[in-house]
């Protein structure tokens, strides 16, 4: 029986690629593919990297799990029963089919994917205690990694630009994080939801208190990372709020940094193109736009003061009385969906007051946010009992290899 153990690999030079949470051979069939294509694949963070062979250290493709919706088991066409080697990964804008060598390998892939996207060890897969232990280790690593990263729905935009983005591109999501504007380490959350037939934009303050982020709602909620902040908003609206995610294709557009002639600051510049602007969320079958079901879903908890939340000014910065009022966004033009144009960057410096951080790569290997999903498929358990002894031996071998 084929094993999920790693075949021998040429050691990778240090610093070339991060070690994978899990890796094995995997056959992949995307929405545009006629047939399955075999890769060596590794999961790291929220990205599956695909290599031509298990000796390569340069990936040829990668798949971001930021728009994860669910995993399902696949019964191959023409089959009457589930052979246990096919599964489907459903993202917000596409479905990818996978084929592996064994049922064990399939359950491992599903388990590790669910661990990183849901930040919990799945309990309803056919996995051994050793597998679950490995997943709990990965969970700890992923939580530590997330605590240090900025979610991809964090954009270096102003309050008005945030509202404008959510209004113009509802299909990309309806929640984004942005700088707070009070000069502190905090952030603001901008959301757009349907309320009584009108789209309403809301802004929430998230204050930095030591190592924690505190969401300023009626009962202030403390989070360990910005990622957790996003998860709070997603989960407290039963997924009515969807983190703003940009199209993978824009990663291919190269920008460059040049010094602003006026003040010497570095400014991120993307190649320009004519026309009204890009449509950043394209490709693959689309689910319903996030806005379509929002009026049926619960809003966030009430704010402490619908009129204003006061933020203590930091240093010489102006006092910003942060608004948590609703803003009905009614005066917007019809947006044409033009041909794709190069992507302006996430973080655009706007002098003259202070330089902004360096440009952010949206679909960088390790830096994506996800809408949390609780969709759990049912998995077959028959026929696995006789594998137990063999699996445990393999696990012991694997642990020995890794330590």
């Amino acid at each position: 029986m084929a094993s999920a153990l790693r075949p021998p690999r040429v050691p990778k030079p240090k610093g070339v690629l991060p070690s994978h949470y899990y890796e094995s051979f995997l056959e992949k069939k995307g929405p545009c593919d006629r047939d399955y294509k075999k890769f060596w694949a590794g999961l790291q963070g929220l990205t599956i990297y695909f290599y031509n062979s298990n000796r390569d250290f340069q990936h040829v493709e990668k798949l971001n799990l930021g728009a994860f919706e669910k995993l399902t088991d696949e019964i191959p066409w023409g089959s009457s029963r589930d052979p246990g080697t096919h599964f489907s990964l459903i993202l917000r804008d596409q479905e990818i089919k996978f084929k592996v060598e064994t049922l064990e390998c399939r359950e491992m892939w599903k388990g590790f994917i669910l661990t990183v996207v849901e930040l919990r060890v799945p309990t309803d897969l056919t996995l051994l205690p050793g597998h679950l232990y490995m997943m709990s280790e990965v969970l700890a690593k992923e939580e530590a990694r997330r605590a240090l990263e900025t979610p991809s729905c964090f954009l270096k935009v102003s309050r008005l630009e945030a509202q404008l983005l959510l209004e113009r591109y509802p299909e990309c999501g309806n929640l984004l994080l942005r700088p707070s504007g009070d000069g502190a380490d905090g952030v603001s959350v901008t959301t757009r939801q349907m309320h009584n037939g009108t789209h309403v934009v809301r802004h929430y303050k998230v204050k930095r208190e030591g190592p924690k982020y505190v969401i300023d709602v009626e009962q202030p909620f403390s989070c360990t990372s910005l990622d957790a902040v996003v998860n709070y908003f997603v989960s407290h609206t039963k997924k009515a709020l969807v983190p703003f995610l940009l199209d993978e294709d824009y990663e291919k557009v190269l920008g460059y940094v040049e010094a602003d002639k006026e003040n010497g600051e570095n400014v991120w510049v993307a190649p320009s193109a004519p026309g009204p602007g890009p449509a950043p969320c394209t490709g693959g079958p689309k689910p319903l736009s996030p806005a379509s079901s929002q009026d049926k879903l619960p809003p966030l908890p009430p704010l402490p003061n619908q009129e204003e939340n006061y933020v203590t000014p930091i240093g010489d910065g102006p006092a910003v009385d942060y608004e948590n009022q609703d803003v009905a966004s009614s005066s917007w033009p019809v947006i044409l969906k033009p041909k794709k144009l190069p992507k302006p960057p996430a973080k655009l410096p706007k002098p003259p007051v202070g330089p902004k951080p360096e440009p952010k790569v949206f679909n960088g290997g390790l830096g994506r946010k996800l809408p949390v999903s609780s969709a759990q498929p049912l998995f077959p358990t028959a026929g696995l009992a006789d594998m137990t002894a063999e699996l445990q031996k393999k696990l012991e071998k694997r642990r020995a290899l890794e330590h």
């Epitope: 404008l164 002639k261 910065g317």
Partner: antibody, heavy 124, light 107 residues
Framework: EVQLLESGGGLVQPGGSLRLSCAAS????????MGWVRQAPGKGLEWVSG????????SYADSVKGRFTISRDNSKNTLYLQMNSLRAEDTAVYYC?????????????????WGQGTLVTVSS | DIQMTQSPSSLSASVGDRVTITCRAS??????LNWYQQKPGKAPKLLIY???SLQSGVPSRFSGSGSGTDFTLTISSLQPEDFATYYC?????????FGQGTKLEIK
């Protein structure tokens, strides 16, 4: 030195069209949102339209929605305002203005640089 | 739309006077308010952003205050070059709106 230079204004009949241009120099044009603000003779300032640096999101005043189109060409450092179905009440000096976000100390926008304006007269 | 109302619409004062112009928003706009100065035949010039922050290069005799719906622009000691029209503008939400202006004239 930051400079904004409007052009394209002139006399046009009601129902006619004009295209205003604003040539920007002295700063990295692609990194800033931009806007058009107009001022009818002897009147106050009226915001007309804005275009974001970020994905070129656009917004319009109700009075011009459906008739005016704002656009930009970053390769030419130029902002445009296509004005169709012009009316007498569109007669004004049209200013191009740079919108900036004040960095870490504030998340609002303000027009920090303005062009000298171009006069559009709609009359039969 | 958010309406911005300035008062007074015109004001006569002398060099050295302390002058205050007020601006009221039809709904709370937090501190998303800017003040501009415009002289005849010229483009407007940004004086104050975020209700109270002085734009670079603007003399310190200009100051702004307020939050929510009520804002003031104060010129502590009028200089001859300050006689102009002053506008407030909200950047809380689109459409961006200006006050009708306050014309400051020499007494």
């Amino acid at each position: 030195e930051v400079q904004l230079l409007e052009s394209g204004g002139g006399l046009v009949q009601p129902g006619g069209s004009l295209r205003l241009s604003c040539a920007a120099s002295g700063f990295t044009f692609s990194g800033y949102s931009m806007g058009w603000v107009r001022q009818a003779p002897g009147k106050g300032l009226e915001w007309v339209s804005g275009i974001s640096s970020y994905y070129y999101g656009t917004s319009y005043a109700d009075s011009v929605k459906g008739r005016f189109t704002i656009s930009r060409d970053n390769s030419k450092n130029t902002l445009y305002l296509q004005m169709n179905s012009l009316r007498a009440e569109d007669t004004a000096v049209y200013y191009c203005a740079r919108s900036w976000t004040v960095g870490s100390s504030w998340d609002g926008d303000a027009f920090d640089y303005w062009g000298q304006g171009t006069l559009v007269t709609v009359s039969s | 739309d958010i309406q911005m109302t300035q008062s007074p619409s015109s004001l006569s004062a002398s060099v050295g006077d302390r002058v205050t112009i007020t601006c009221r928003a039809s709904q709370s706009i937090s501190s998303y308010l800017n003040w501009y100065q415009q002289k005849p035949g010229k483009a407007p010039k940004l004086l104050i952003y975020a209700a109270s922050s002085l734009q670079s290069g603007v003399p310190s005799r200009f100051s702004g205050s307020g939050s929510g719906t009520d804002f003031t622009l104060t010129i502590s000691s009028l200089q001859p070059e300050d006689f102009a029209t002053y506008y407030c503008q909200q950047s809380y939400w689109y459409p961006l709106t200006f006050g009708q202006g306050t014309k400051l004239e020499i007494k």
